[in-house]
């Protein structure tokens, strides 16, 4: 079944932006004028999750690459990953649990949350230049909250 | 505050085009999603499409290769082109802001624009 | 496509009346549905979201259940302001999004 989509970018709650940091690494740092073309386009899908009242179930794919972010267990840790796919068959409306988010949207800000572990975030660090990953607290210093920006292409 | 003001509607004679706009505030187009949904005289509520980034349009079936949705986010104004119109084509036409990215629901609605397809 | 489809097409109720309005989508759709009140010559307002969150300014007379593909619409006691047309909306089956052909209130 056809999903809806659409193509994004994302900046956490300091304003850092999400730019690539090696072939399958995301960091987030502040960007300003020209650079500002590094950071990240993501391609957003609307896809099947669990039944929910606030939460709205998405993929994160990297557009025109066939990456998606998902969320796997490594040693024992639930961690944030780029995996590539066969681009032939995503996105899909019924997404692997492991690609699947919980975007939680209140005032313009958002959350995702993993479906595959409940609780854990997209999270970026204070400190700059640092990698994004799955963060197991929320409102501690780590920072889960962000916000959305369309691109036009 | 939010506000959502159409404009464009009239009377346009049957295989005409027309061009509505939608004129937003108290928002940004950058992070939401604007859809379109008319209602002819007397009759019920019928989606007609939405818009998320300039390259991601959706349409219902009936729609899909005479009606277009843009924005000129800039401007603030979402827009609906109109072409190969038809009598049945007459309803008032709403510009409505989606409440979350991919909730589908409208939480804020113009007050609508009548367009008028007669000859 | 999902077709939308409510009933009854018209309700004649009294004032402190309970009434219960349904809706039922031709396919599942979880809990991806809406409803709308809209008054004459007026646009329409959101009352309910994902089959049972009240919108922001919603009486709390208004709730909705259900999933799948039965939904209901209640007013628990209806006020004179409830007289209207009420849709219920599809918002997540695949791209398309799809009202249901409207129930109008009606005083008895």
């Known amino acids: 079944a056809p999903v809806r989509s659409l193509n994004c970018t994302l900046r956490d709650s300091q304003q850092k932006s999400l730019v690539m940091s090696g072939p399958y690494e995301l960091k987030a740092l502040h960007l300003q004028g020209q650079d500002m073309e590094q950071q990240v386009v993501f391609s957003m899908s609307f896809v099947q999750g669990e039944e929910s009242n606030d939460k709205i179930p998405v993929a994160l794919g990297l557009k025109e690459k066939n990456l998606y972010l998902s969320c796997v267990l490594k040693d024992d840790k639930p961690t944030l990953q780029l995996e590539s796919v066969d681009p032939k068959n995503y996105p899909k409306k019924k997404m692997e649990k492991r690609f699947v988010f919980n975007k939680i949207e209140i005032n313009n800000k958002l959350e995702f949350e993993s479906a595959q572990f409940p609780n854990w975030y997209i999270s970026t660090s204070q400190a700059e230049n640092m990698p994004v990953f799955l963060g197991g607290t929320k409102g501690g210093q780590d920072i889960t909250d962000f916000t959305m920006q369309f691109v036009s292409s | 505050e939010v506000q959502l003001v159409e404009s464009g509607g009239g009377l346009v004679q049957p295989g005409g085009s027309l061009r509505l706009s939608c004129t937003v505030s108290?928002?940004?187009?950058?992070?939401?999603?604007m859809s379109w949904v008319r209602q002819a005289p007397g009759k019920g509520l019928e989606w007609v499409g939405i818009i998320y980034d300039s390259a991601s349009t959706y349409y219902a079936s009936w729609a899909k290769g005479r009606f277009t949705i843009s924005k000129d986010t800039s401007k603030n104004t979402v827009y609906l082109q109109m072409n190969s119109l038809r009598a049945e084509d007459t309803a008032v036409y709403y510009c409505a802001r989606e409440r979350a990215i991919f909730s589908g629901d409208f939480d804020y609605w113009g007050q609508g624009t009548l367009v008028t397809v007669s000859s | 496509e999902i077709v939308m489809t409510q009933s009854p097409s018209t309700l004649s109720a009294s004032v402190g009346d309970r009434v219960i309005i349904t809706c039922q989508a031709s396919?599942?759709?979880?809990?991806?549905l809406s409803w709308y009140q809209q008054k004459p010559g007026k646009a329409p307002k959101l009352l309910i979201y994902?089959?049972?969150t009240l919108a922001s300014g919603v009486p709390s007379r208004f709730s909705g259940s259900g999933s799948g593909a039965e939904f209901t619409l209640t007013i628990s006691s209806l006020q004179p302001d409830d007289f209207a047309t009420y849709y219920c909306?599809?918002?997540?089956?695949?791209?398309?999004?799809?009202f249901g052909q409207g129930t109008k209130l009606t005083v008895l």
């Open positions: 909306q599809n918002t997540g089956g695949g791209v398309s999004i799809a």
């Open positions: 108290g928002f940004s187009l950058s992070s939401y999603a």
């Open positions: 396919q599942s759709i979880d809990n991806w």
């Open positions: 994902r089959a049972s």
